[in-house]
């Protein structure tokens, strides 16, 4: 288990101001810690690179429900 | 052991305003956590209030609670409530509750007992 | 918005039986985002579940938490008398919305 207080914590101080497609988008994670200035979900993106994004944005939670839903589709 | 004890519940008047403390021991607000107040109206359900973290400050709050109530660290251990402009709806069950880590989705695994505010002419 | 929904309010079981509670996010917060909590009368509640299906510290495997996306469920076998009590759900997906982060309450009642 890893040692959740002493772990490194990933902090956004800035978020994009445009709206990345979803087609460009293959993960996320929610930054929730108590150690943040700010909440934030960072993307990854289908080329590796990691985006800062505000979650109250409208845009953000669609692309978070789509890749949520691409989840829970097994893929054939 | 780790604990939360809150205190200040009282009896009060329509209209008045009250300080609800919580207070620490066992373990230091220097290991970050989310600290929040939680309450719960005699045979109803739990109610987030408002949340801080315990290293940094930043505060949040339920929409109906801003403005009226203010979440502060007032020190190492302590964390309080105040609240203005009570009403009878506001009478309840106030707990303080820890985050079992830094991070908002594991949860509160330590919860204070509760202290009973009620408010009544 | 991240309203929670518990379904349903009340429900008795017999002991050694099995009892569902539905939680239900009135949008989607992953698979990672869901506690579940066993409050009994006069008692702060009690952490059971963390992350949909981590049972935290001390908990009994009888209770296993699964779900994802909007649709969320604790489920409690071979029920012991101790199990009767009030269960939660909470959202752990956002800090910013803290407007009905906990779901109404499912009282489980052992005969």
């Known amino acids: 288990q890893p040692d959740a207080i002493n772990a490194p914590v990933t902090c956004c101080y800035n978020f994009t101001n445009r709206k990345i497609s979803v087609q460009r988008l293959a993960s996320y994670r929610r930054i929730t810690s108590s150690k943040c200035p700010k909440e934030a979900v960072i993307f990854k993106t289908i080329v590796a690179k990691e985006i800062c994004a505000d979650p109250k944005q409208k845009w953000v939670q669609d692309s978070m429900d789509h890749l949520d839903k691409q989840t829970q589709t097994p893929k054939t | 052991q780790e604990q939360l004890v809150e205190s200040g519940g009282d009896l009060v008047k329509p209209e008045g305003s009250l300080t609800l403390t919580c207070t620490a021991s066992?373990?230091?607000?220097?290991?970050?956590?989310?600290m929040c107040w939680v309450r719960q109206a005699p045979g109803k359900g739990l109610e987030l209030i408002a949340c801080?973290?315990?290293?940094?400050?930043?505060t949040y709050y339920a929409s109906w609670a801003e403005g009226r109530f203010t979440i502060s660290k007032t020190s190492s251990t302590t964390v309080t409530l105040q609240m203005t402009s009570l009403t009878v709806a506001d009478t309840a069950t106030y707990f303080c509750?820890?985050?079992?880590?830094?991070?908002?989705?594991?949860?509160?695994?330590?919860w204070g007992p509760g202290t009973l505010v009620t408010v009544s002419s | 918005a991240y309203d929670m929904t518990q379904t349903p309010a009340s429900v008795e079981v017999g002991v050694g039986g099995t009892v569902t509670i539905k939680c239900q996010a009135s949008?989607?917060?992953?698979?990672?985002?869901l506690s579940w909590y066993q409050q009994k009368p006069g008692q702060p509640p009690k952490l059971l579940i963390y992350?949909?299906?981590t049972l935290a510290s001390g908990v009994s495997s009888r209770f296993k938490g699964s779900g994802s996306g909007t649709q969320f469920t604790l489920t409690i076998s071979g029920v012991e008398s101790a199990d009767s009590a009030t269960y939660y759900c909470?959202?752990?997906?956002?800090?910013?919305?803290?407007?009905?982060?906990f779901g109404g309450g499912t009282e489980v009642v052992v005969k």
């Open positions: 949008q989607s917060i992953g698979n990672r985002y």
């Open positions: 909470q959202q752990g997906a956002t800090i910013s919305y803290l407007d009905n982060a």
């Open positions: 992350g949909t299906s």
């Open positions: 509750a820890r985050t079992t880590d830094d991070n908002w989705n594991v949860g509160f695994n330590l």
């Open positions: 801080i973290s315990s290293s940094i400050g930043v």
């Open positions: 066992g373990f230091s607000f220097s290991t970050s956590y989310w």
